[in-house]
């Protein structure tokens, strides 16, 4: 499945992943109760297809976005250039770190997700994107997410 | 198993300086973030400083700033601590993280 069209890097990180915490470096605004697996998608050109559904306010938001590669391995941009993105491997197996800055609700932000192809939680993979967060000058609190694999509007 | 060993603590006159090391082994170092941390008598431990794996990106607490400078060598697994300009409250054990885990720390004492 590994075409030259699509890129190593972008196969790697293809399929289901579990968002597993967050943070930012300011208070965002809607944070999610729940999420469903993060799917992402390669395409060809190198470019990936993100697709998530979050539970926020007892609604149910359906996000895809279209992450589009860069010269740079592991940096993408989305939103028409309004935000970067940068995919990048945790020390622990089977984890990724997604970093990303650009505009939210009109103001400039910067947030890191960790994301894990196993829905249970791993302390080192949670402990190392810690550290990674304050070597970013990431400093709100780490959001735990909770798991669903659909997303029910006015429950879990 | 995750092991992390820091080195080159000392006695130090004010205004003086002194690198730490931590050799990290056990995780693949070059792709795990890794911090400083202090301890001083009586007194909660405190982070110091971060580092991310390639070593872009660092970050300082703000009574370290401009004084401390946090490198690392990933093919040496080992990460840096440069104290320059110490001062008698920079008086702690320092110690090393990486992936949750915690060295044993080194012993820095800054008097006359």
């Known amino acids: 499945q590994d075409t030259p069209a699509l890129g190593k890097d972008t196969v790697a990180v293809s399929g289901k992943w579990y968002l597993k915490a967050m943070t930012a470096d300011q208070e965002v605004p809607e944070k999610p109760d729940s999420v469903t697996p993060m799917i992402l998608k390669a395409q060809k050109g190198g470019n990936l297809e993100a697709k998530i559904t979050m539970l926020t306010n007892g609604q149910c938001q359906n996000i895809t976005v279209v992450l589009h590669k860069t010269s740079e391995p592991g940096k993408y941009t989305a939103y028409e250039g309004q935000r970067v993105v940068f995919i990048q491997p945790s020390p622990v197996r089977d984890h990724y770190i997604l970093y990303c800055e650009g505009e939210l609700h009109g103001r400039q932000i910067r947030m890191a997700k960790l994301l894990g192809r196993d829905p249970e939680q791993s302390q080192e993979a949670l402990e190392d994107f810690r550290e990674f967060s304050r070597a970013k000058g990431l400093n709100q609190e780490i959001l735990e997410l909770a798991q669903s694999e659909t997303c029910s509007p006015g429950g879990q | 198993q995750v092991q992390l060993v820091e080195s080159g603590g000392g006695l130090v006159q004010p205004g003086g300086s002194l690198r730490l090391s931590c050799a990290a082994s056990?995780?693949?170092?070059?792709?795990?973030?890794m911090g400083w941390y202090r301890q001083a008598p009586e007194k909660e431990r405190e982070w110091v400083a971060s580092?991310?794996?390639?070593?872009?990106?660092?970050n300082y607490a703000d009574s370290v700033k401009g004084r401390f400078t946090v490198s690392r060598d990933n093919a040496k697994n080992t990460v840096y601590l440069q104290m320059n300009s110490l001062k008698p409250e920079d008086t702690a054990v320092y110690y090393c993280?990486?992936?949750?885990?915690w060295g044993k720390g080194t012993l820095v004492t800054v008097s006359s």
């Open positions: 056990g995780f693949t170092f070059r792709l795990a973030a």
């Open positions: 580092i991310t794996g390639p070593g872009t990106d660092t």
């Open positions: 993280r990486g992936m949750g885990y």
